[in-house]
Interface confidence: low
Amino acid sequence: EDELQVIQPEKSVSVAAGESATLRCAMTSLIPVGPIMWFRGAGAGRELIYNQKEGHFPRVTTVSELTKRNNLDFSISISNITPADAGTYYCVKFRKGSPDDVEFKSGAGTELSVRAKPSAPVVSGPAVRATPEHTVSFTCESHGFSPRDITLKWFKNGNELSDFQTNVDPAGDSVSYSIHSTARVVLTRGDVHSQVICEIAHITLQGDPLRGTANLSEAIRVPPTLEVTQQPMRAENQANVTCQVSNFYPRGLQLTWLENGNVSRTETASTLIENKDGTYNWMSWLLVNTCAHRDDVVLTCQVEHDGQQAVSKSYALEISAHQKEHGSDITHEAALAPTAPL
C-alpha cells in the first residue's frame, strides 16, 4: 500500500480581516492510525492552531466530521481573521505512540495572507502659520494595512502635488504596515480657501480610495496692507483720517492710532468684510479737530495682526496758519466702516 501523503492543495490563501479562512488538508490513507494537528510556522517555535485529539480551539472549526468513519478531509476554518493570523499553516499527521504520538508527515504548507484596510488617513499641518510664498509641510498617516502594496497621492485643490516623500514601515515582512508621507506646499495669497488632500489606494478598498484633508486656512497668515488717507470734510476745522486695512487673514487684528507718536486710541477689529478669496478688510477712522493743534500732526495707524510684530502707516496732517491762531479741544470719534471687497 502506498505511504500516506498529506496534501495541502493551496500554496496560499488571502482573506480579508474579519472574515473566516478555510485551510484545506487531505490524507491519501487512513494508515497509520493517529491524530492530525495544524501548526502555524515550522520548527521548534511553531504555534499549535488545532489538535484533533484534545484541547479547546474556539476560533477553529473542522470542515468535515473528523470522527466519521473513513474521513480523509482534515480542512479547518479559522474565524474572525486579523493581520496577526498571517503566516504559513502546516497540516501534520502523527502516528499513535506510547507515551507520546510521533510526528509522521507534514503537508507542504499554506501561506495565509490577510488583507487589512488602511485606517482613515490623518492629515496634519504645520504648528505655526506661514505667509504666502513660503513652503509648509503637511503629513499624512495611515496604519494597519496589509499587504504592503499601497499608493499615496497628494492634491491641492484637485491638482496633484509632486514634492513629497513617503515611507512604508516596517521595511521587512510584518502582519500589518503603516504609511507616512510628508508633502511640501508653497502657499499663495489665495490659499485661505485651499485644501490639501492625501489619497490612499489599496487592494482592500476596491478602487474607492480613502482621503484625508487639511485646510490651508489653518496654515496660512496673510499680512494686511495699510492705507491712510484724509477724507473731505464740510467743516473746515475738522479732519477725517481713515486707515484701510486690507486683505488679511486670520481675523485677529488690533489697531492703534497715534498722534505725534502718542497713543490716541486702540481698538480690536470686530465687524469685518470678507473678500472672495477669504481674506478680510476693515476700516477705522479718526476725526481730528484741527483747531486744537498749532503745529502739523503726524497721525499713525499701527496694526498688530495675529500676534505678529506691528506694522504701521503714517499720514502728515497739515494745520493751516489760520487754524494755528485759534486753539480749541480735540475730539476723537471711532467708527467701524464697512468697505466693499477689493
Epitope: E133, D149, L152, L161, S162, D163, T166, V168, V186
Partner: antibody, heavy 123, light 107 residues
Framework: QIQLVQSGPELKKPGETVKISCKAS????????MSWVKQAPGKGLKWMVW????????TYADDFKGRFAFSLETSASTSYLQINNLKNEDTATYFC????????????????WGQGTLVTVSA | DIVMTQSQKFMSTTIGDRVSITCEAS??????VAWYQQKPGQSPKLLIY???NRYTGVPDRFTGSGSGTDFTLTISNMQSEDLANYFC?????????FGSGTKLEVK
C-alpha cells in the same frame, strides 16, 4: 552598487519602431520609481514619463503621449521604452533615471542615471 | 507647464573664479529645484536638490540658493573639471521641466 544599464545605440528609418531597455541592479526594482528623459543632440533635457514600478502605472508628459509606450519586466528588473512610427525629431539620447525616494513617492530629483541610449532616425 | 529659464547659454570663466548660474521659474516652485552637471557624452550628475542641499560627495565649492522663482548655483572656486553644462530642474508640478542649460567655458 546601484547601476542602471541601458541597451546599445539604434539606427532606424522613419516609420519604424524601436524598443530600448534599462536594466537595474543593486536594489529592489519595485521599491523605486523610474523616469525616462530625452536629450536631443546639443539640446537640453526633457522629462518624458515616470513609472510607478510597484503598480506599473505611468505618468506621462503631454508631449510623449501616443507614439511612446513604457513597460516593465519586474522579474528582470528592467524598464522599456518603445517608440512607434519613428520621426526624425525622435533622434536623441534617451536616459532612464531612478527616483531618490524609497517606495511610493512621486519622482523628484534624479541621483542614478543610465548611460543613455542614442537613437538615430534617418532615411 | 512651468518654464525654467537659464538666460545665459554660455559663460566664460577663469580657473579660481566665483561663478553664479541663475535659473528662473515661470511660477512659484518653492524649493523643489535640483541642479545637474553634464559633461559631453556623459549622463547628468546630481549636484544640488531641494534648492540648497548638496548631494553626497559633491565638493563644497558648489552651493545652491533661492526659493520661490529665482535660483542660483554658485561655484566658489572654479576648477578645470567644472567646465561642463549645468541644468536646473523643477519637481514642484507635472510635467517636470529642466532649464535649457548654461555651458561654462574657459576664457
Amino acid at each position: 552598487q546601484i547601476q542602471l544599464v541601458q541597451s546599445g545605440p539604434e539606427l532606424k528609418k522613419p516609420g519604424e519602431t524601436v524598443k530600448i531597455s534599462c536594466k537595474a541592479s543593486g536594489y529592489t526594482f519595485t521599491t523605486y520609481g523610474m523616469s525616462w528623459v530625452k536629450q536631443a543632440p546639443g539640446k537640453g533635457l526633457k522629462w518624458m514619463v515616470w513609472i510607478n514600478t510597484y503598480s506599473g502605472v505611468p505618468t506621462y508628459a503631454d508631449d510623449f503621449k501616443g507614439r511612446f509606450a513604457f513597460s516593465l519586466e519586474t522579474s528582470a528588473s528592467t524598464s522599456y521604452l518603445q517608440i512607434n512610427n519613428l520621426k526624425n525629431e525622435d533622434t536623441a539620447t534617451y536616459f532612464c533615471a531612478r527616483d531618490p525616494h524609497y517606495y511610493g513617492s512621486s519622482p523628484a530629483w534624479f541621483v542614478y542615471w543610465g548611460q543613455g541610449t542614442l537613437v538615430t532616425v534617418s532615411a | 507647464d512651468i518654464v525654467m529659464t537659464q538666460s545665459q547659454k554660455f559663460m566664460s570663466t577663469t580657473i579660481g573664479d566665483r561663478v553664479s548660474i541663475t535659473c528662473e521659474a515661470s511660477q512659484i516652485v518653492g524649493i523643489a529645484v535640483a541642479w545637474y552637471q553634464q559633461k559631453p557624452g556623459q549622463s547628468p550628475k546630481l549636484l544640488i536638490y531641494s534648492a540648497s542641499n548638496r548631494y553626497t560627495g559633491v565638493p563644497d565649492r558648489f552651493t545652491g540658493s533661492g526659493s520661490g522663482t529665482d535660483f542660483t548655483l554658485t561655484i566658489s572656486n572654479m576648477q578645470s573639471e567644472d567646465l561642463a553644462n549645468y541644468f536646473c530642474q523643477q519637481y514642484s508640478a507635472y510635467p517636470f521641466t529642466f532649464g535649457s542649460g548654461t555651458k561654462l567655458e574657459v576664457k
